[in-house]
């Protein structure tokens, strides 16, 4: 395993509709032709995972079905889309890549994003 | 095991407001919203409104804004849900039911519900 | 306002069919959406939650997919213990609307 640089943006506020969205990046070493992708969220110690998605490069990001997570890929950049969120889900959300194919497999671990997710006070029908 | 327990049923008049409780237990009370829904008698569901039990912060369906308040009390783990104006069409059954943040593992909205309690609305 | 249309609003089916129920909401809500069944008289229980999660407990009979606006509720096979109510409900944000629900009656 072998380590790898990845890059994202320290603090994003998610919108009134409760969706987040921000870049994660990598230095890719090499011409990785399959990247998985993973979010994780880091809260009171615990680490959950969000979601996660395995795209062949040139391709689109494939999430599971039930996922709160959509996402596009361009070059060695990965655009990802959290929806959903509300206060509760306020917390780190970690950008983890793994260069899967070919060989070496490559690990890059990002060192966060704060989402900040504000619950809205009453009014006509808004978005909670 | 996780439990709602609402309070028993009630007979108001109309103009009147009634307020009915919603204990929970089982689960860490302030790590999950708490929604209200009412049914009125042979009628669908109908959504009032939730509240986050960590910060009291509440959002509410736009007909009951003016009508409908819903607080906490984190020492008894019990969400209050009050309705002022009574009606007879607010006669029906009124339900608690949690949902955690869309982040937690295996988390699924709505997934307990309180057994329901009648209030009607009569002179 | 935001609308949740099931359809049908009632049906009639044999033990063993395939019944679909669907449910269309007026604005995108990704995959946000829960199905409920409600026998008369009981509490609402859920069936699926984020539009095809099968809600730990439940029968595999049921199933769910669709995304967007468009979203669909699938008995494989009808069992007795099937008559209900089912409701559709967004859980994108507030408001959490529920559909109008289906009637769903035995031959």
């Known amino acids: 395993c072998k380590a790898m640089h990845v890059a994202q943006p320290a603090v994003v506020l998610a919108s009134s509709r409760g969706i987040a969205s921000f870049v994660c990046e990598y230095a890719s070493p090499g011409k990785a032709t399959e990247v998985r992708v993973t979010v994780l969220r880091q809260a009171d110690s615990q680490v959950t995972e969000v979601c996660a998605a395995t795209y062949m490069m040139g391709n689109e990001l494939t999430f599971l079905d039930d996922s709160i997570c959509t996402g596009t890929s361009s070059g060695n950049q990965v655009n990802l889309t959290i929806q959903g969120l509300r206060a509760m889900d306020t917390g780190l959300y970690i950008c983890k890549v793994e260069l899967m194919y070919p060989p070496p497999y490559y690990l890059g671990i990002g060192n966060g994003t704060q989402i900040y997710v504000i619950d809205p006070e009453p009014c006509p029908d808004s978005d909670f | 095991q996780v439990q709602l327990v609402q309070s028993g049923a009630e007979v108001q008049k109309p103009g009147a407001s009634v307020k009915v409780s919603c204990k929970a237990s089982g689960y860490t009370f302030t790590s999950y919203y708490m929604h209200w829904v009412r049914q009125a008698p042979g009628q669908g569901l109908e959504w009032m409104g939730i509240?986050?039990?960590?910060?009291?912060?509440?959002n509410y369906a736009q007909k009951f804004l003016d009508r409908l308040t819903m607080t906490r009390d984190t020492s008894t783990s019990t969400v209050y849900m009050e309705l002022s104006g009574l009606r007879s069409e607010d006669t029906a059954v009124y339900y608690c039911a949690r949902d955690p943040p869309i982040t937690m593992f295996r988390g699924a909205p709505f997934d307990y519900w309180g057994q329901g309690t009648l209030v009607t609305v009569s002179s | 306002d935001i609308q949740l249309t099931q359809s049908p609003s009632s049906l009639s089916a044999s033990v063993g069919d395939r019944v679909t129920i669907t449910c269309r909401v007026s604005q995108d809500i990704s995959r946000l959406l829960n199905w409920y069944r409600q026998k008369p008289g009981e509490i609402p229980k859920l069936l699926i939650y984020?539009?095809?999660s099968l809600q730990s407990g439940v029968p595999s009979r049921f199933s769910g997919s669709g995304s967007g606006t468009d979203f669909t509720l699938t008995i494989s096979s009808l069992q007795p213990e099937d008559i209900a109510t089912y409701y559709c409900q967004r859980t994108y944000s507030a408001p959490y609307t529920f559909g109008q629900g289906t009637k769903l009656e035995i031959k």
């Open positions: 509240i986050n039990p960590s910060g009291g912060s509440s």
């Open positions: 984020r539009a095809s």
